[in-house]
Interface confidence: medium
């Protein structure tokens, strides 16, 4: 599956635990592998063009989201969301995807 | 079409019980989020309490904790709010709405509402 | 808990004014803040989710805006349907938290 797929149903995923059912052990469960994959590094074009384009700000994301778990401040976690909403608005905007 | 529709409301007195009900149609209800929100007469609007209906996971409005119970039978499409040790100041209109999220977005909100149902807590 | 300041209160305003009404949070709340409009006797109805996206159906003089924690509804010409009170709504956490309304009268 292409890395934009999956990082789209994952943030999806992700928000329905968090938002839904305020879970926040489920949320890192869907978060962490993708950002493994991510740290993995890029082994096609398509890999590569994501990278390039989103995987500065979901590494800030998830630094924000890491603090959260040392801090306990819930306003950590409100950074990760303010930029996980912004890539999953450009990855849904580029790539077509219907809800 | 989606439809949330209360009832159960009326007149209890104070310490009394009542058990709400939000029968819901047209939508997934197992994988829904359904809300309470209440309104006192001539007052704005109050969070109350929510459930995921997969899961069953809950949430509460301190005002209520301890006194309300939200449930959901998904073999009925009916969310629930038990009130039990009801005092004067939950006289209010109570409402349920489904919660949900959108394309393009991540963020959720209310976006079907029921017609309401009147509580009055009076001795 | 979040506060959700909305202001003002009331206001009153005429068919085709622009009407712009502000909510502020407490602290970071992200986008995640939605506008409802409910009529007397009724229930309240959702008009923007996720701070600016228009929710489907709504008329288009509608629109949202986000500035830090600082959240507009604005109403870019008035009509006569659309006398009512908004609220805003955050989701982020809970509880979660609604202004304490705007109520839009006819001048």
């Known amino acids: 599956i292409l890395w934009h797929e999956q990082w789209h149903e994952g943030l999806e995923e992700a928000s329905r635990l968090y938002f839904g059912d305020r879970n926040v052990k489920g949320m890192f469960e869907i978060l962490e592998p993708l950002h493994a994959m991510l740290e993995r590094g890029p082994q096609t074009l398509k890999e590569t063009s994501f990278s390039q384009a989103y995987g500065r700000e979901l590494t800030e994301a998830y630094e924000w989201s890491q603090r959260y778990k040392t801090s306990a401040v819930v306003m950590d976690l409100d950074r990760a969301w303010d930029i996980y909403y912004h890539v999953f608005q450009k990855i849904s905007r580029h790539h077509h995807h219907h809800h | 079409e989606v439809q949330l529709v209360e009832s159960g409301g009326g007149l209890v007195q104070p310490g009394g019980s009542l058990r709400l009900s939000c029968a819901a149609s047209g939508f997934n209800f197992y994988s829904s989020y359904i809300h309470w929100v209440r309104q006192a007469p001539g007052k704005g609007l109050e969070w109350v309490a929510s459930i995921s209906s997969s899961s069953g996971s809950t949430s509460y409005a301190d005002s209520v904790k301890g006194r309300f119970t939200i449930s959901a039978d998904t073999s009925k499409n009916t969310a629930y709010l038990q009130m039990n040790s009801l005092r004067a100041e939950d006289t209010a209109v109570y409402y349920c709405?489904?919660?949900?999220?959108?394309?393009?977005?991540?963020?959720?909100?209310?976006?079907?509402w029921g017609q309401g149902t009147l509580v009055t807590v009076s001795s | 808990d979040i506060q959700m300041t909305q202001s003002p209160s009331s206001l009153s305003a005429s068919v085709g004014d622009r009407v712009t009404i502000t909510c502020r949070a407490s602290q970071s709340v992200s986008s995640a803040v939605a506008w409802y409009q409910q009529k007397p006797g009724k229930a309240p109805k959702l008009l923007i989710y996720s701070a600016s996206s228009l929710y489907s159906g709504v008329p288009s003089r509608f629109s949202g805006s986000r500035s830090g924690t600082d959240f507009t509804l604005t109403i870019s010409s008035l009509q006569p349907e659309d006398f009512a009170t908004y609220y805003c709504?955050?989701?982020?956490?809970?509880?979660?938290?609604f202004g304490q309304g705007t109520k839009v009268e006819i001048k």
């Open positions: 709504q955050q989701s982020i956490h809970y509880p979660l938290t």
């Open positions: 709405a489904r919660f949900s999220s959108y394309y393009y977005t991540l963020y959720w909100a209310m976006d079907y």
